[in-house]
C-alpha cells in the first residue's frame, strides 16, 4: 500500500435545500484505470461511511441507487455532491481515494471538508 495526497476544501456551507458539493482531488502517481472513492463522516469522534463508488477512468461514478451521493470525474478530480442534508448532518466529510488497478495499490485520505448545514427557518403561520 502506497500513500497518495488528496486535497479537498476545508469548509463548505450546504445550500438551503440541503445540498453540498465539493471537489476531491488526488495526486495520481501513475495511470490508474480503476478508482474507488469513499466519503466518510466524522462527528463526535465517530467515523461512518456516507457513500462509496468505484469507477473506471473516463466513465461516470456509479453510486448505489439509494445513495445520497452523486458525482462526476475529470482527470484526477472527483466532483462530489451530497444531498438530503439536515442540520444534524453537519460534520467533517473525509474523501478517501483508492487506486485499485493496475498495481501498485495507492491509498489517499483527505483532511476533510467541514460541511455546515443550516435547516431553513420555519415559515410563520399565515392566515388566509
Amino acid at each position: 500500500c502506497k500513500a497518495m495526497h488528496v486535497a479537498q476544501p476545508a469548509v463548505v456551507l450546504a445550500s438551503s435545500r440541503g445540498i453540498a458539493s465539493f471537489v476531491c482531488e488526488y495526486a495520481s502517481p501513475g495511470k490508474a484505470t480503476e478508482v474507488r472513492v469513499t466519503v466518510l463522516r466524522q462527528a463526535d469522534s465517530q467515523v461512518t461511511e456516507v457513500c462509496a463508488a468505484t469507477y473506471m477512468m473516463g466513465n461516470e461514478l456509479t453510486f448505489l441507487d439509494d445513495s445520497i451521493c452523486t458525482g462526476t470525474s475529470s482527470g484526477n478530480q472527483v466532483n462530489l455532491t451530497i444531498q438530503g442534508l439536515r442540520a444534524m448532518d453537519t460534520g467533517l466529510y473525509i474523501c478517501k481515494v483508492e487506486l485499485m488497478y493496475p498495481p501498485p495499490y495507492y491509498l489517499g485520505i483527505g483532511n476533510g471538508t467541514q460541511i455546515y448545514v443550516i435547516d431553513p427557518e420555519p415559515c410563520p403561520d399565515s392566515d388566509f
Epitope: 476545508a10 456551507l13 445550500s15 462527528a43 444534524m88
Partner: antibody, heavy 116, light 108 residues
Framework: QVQLVQSGAEVKKPGASVKVSCKAS????????ISWVRQAPGQGLEWMGW????????NYAQKLQGRVTMTTDTSTSTAYMELRSLRSDDTAVYYC?????????WGQGTLVTVSS | EIVLTQSPATLSLSPGERATLSCGAS???????LAWYQQKPGLAPRLLIY???SRATGIPDRFSGSGSGTDFTLTITRLEPEDFAVYYC?????????FGQGTKVEIK
C-alpha cells in the same frame, strides 16, 4: 503567512449603507469561509454571519437578516460585508476572520461610526 | 437561539494561579462545537480552543478546554502576565452561532 487586511474606518449617517472589505492572502481563499463579527464600544462580540468562499452560500444572524449582505470576489480573494439602513447602535468595530471551526485568523478590524 | 452564559463575569487572580472559566449553554451544543477566544484591549480576538478541547495552532498547553452538552470549561493552569484579558466562548453547533458575554481575568 495568512493575512486578512480590512478597509479603513468609515463615518456614516443614519439610514446610509456601509461596505467593508477584507482582502485575504497566504492561503487558498476558496477553501475556507469568512466570518464577520462586530463589537460595539465597550461591549462583547456579536456574530453577524459567514460566507462559504467555496460556493458563495451565506448564513446570517437573524437580527441582521434583510440588512446585511456578504459576498466574495474569488478573483481578488476579497470578502465584503454590506450593512444597510444604518442606525446609531450599528456603531462598532467590524472584524472579518477565516472560518473553519472557529476563527483562527482575524482582520485588524474596521471602525464604523454611525452619527448624524 | 442558544444563549451562552459565562461565569464569573470577572476573575481576580495572581500570576501563577489556576483560572477556571465556565460557559453554560441554554441548549445542548451539538458535536461539541464550542470555541474559546482571548481578547486584549484594542486587538482582534485570538482563537485558543475549538471543538471544545482542541488547541489552536501556537497556543501554549497551559490552556485547555473541556465539557459537553451544556457545560464547558476553559482552564489556564498557571497564569502568565500576558494571560490577563477577556475570554469569550462561542458555539457553532446550531445557527445562529452565538458568543458568551465574556469573562474578564484581571490581576489581583
Amino acid at each position: 503567512q495568512v493575512q486578512l487586511v480590512q478597509s479603513g474606518a468609515e463615518v456614516k449617517k443614519p439610514g446610509a449603507s456601509v461596505k467593508v472589505s477584507c482582502k485575504a492572502s497566504g492561503y487558498t481563499f476558496t477553501s475556507y469561509g469568512i466570518s464577520w463579527v462586530r463589537q460595539a464600544p465597550g461591549q462583547g462580540l456579536e456574530w453577524m454571519g459567514w460566507i462559504s468562499a467555496y460556493n458563495g452560500n451565506t448564513n446570517y444572524a437573524q437580527k441582521l437578516q434583510g440588512r446585511v449582505t456578504m459576498t466574495t470576489d474569488t478573483s481578488t480573494s476579497t470578502a465584503y460585508m454590506e450593512l444597510r439602513s444604518l442606525r446609531s447602535d450599528d456603531t462598532a468595530v467590524y472584524y472579518c476572520g477565516r472560518w473553519v471551526r472557529g476563527v483562527e485568523y482575524w482582520g485588524q478590524g474596521t471602525l464604523v461610526t454611525v452619527s448624524s | 437561539e442558544i444563549v451562552l452564559t459565562q461565569s464569573p463575569a470577572t476573575l481576580s487572580l495572581s500570576p501563577g494561579e489556576r483560572a477556571t472559566l465556565s460557559c453554560g449553554a441554554s441548549q445542548s451544543v451539538s458535536s461539541s462545537y464550542l470555541a474559546w477566544y482571548q481578547q486584549k484591549p484594542g486587538l482582534a480576538p485570538r482563537l485558543l480552543i475549538y471543538d471544545t478541547s482542541s488547541r489552536a495552532t501556537g497556543i501554549p498547553d497551559r490552556f485547555s478546554g473541556s465539557g459537553s452538552g451544556t457545560d464547558f470549561t476553559l482552564t489556564i493552569t498557571r497564569l502568565e502576565p500576558e494571560d490577563f484579558a477577556v475570554y469569550y466562548c462561542q458555539q457553532y453547533g446550531r445557527s445562529p452561532w452565538t458568543f458568551g458575554q465574556g469573562t474578564k481575568v484581571e490581576i489581583k
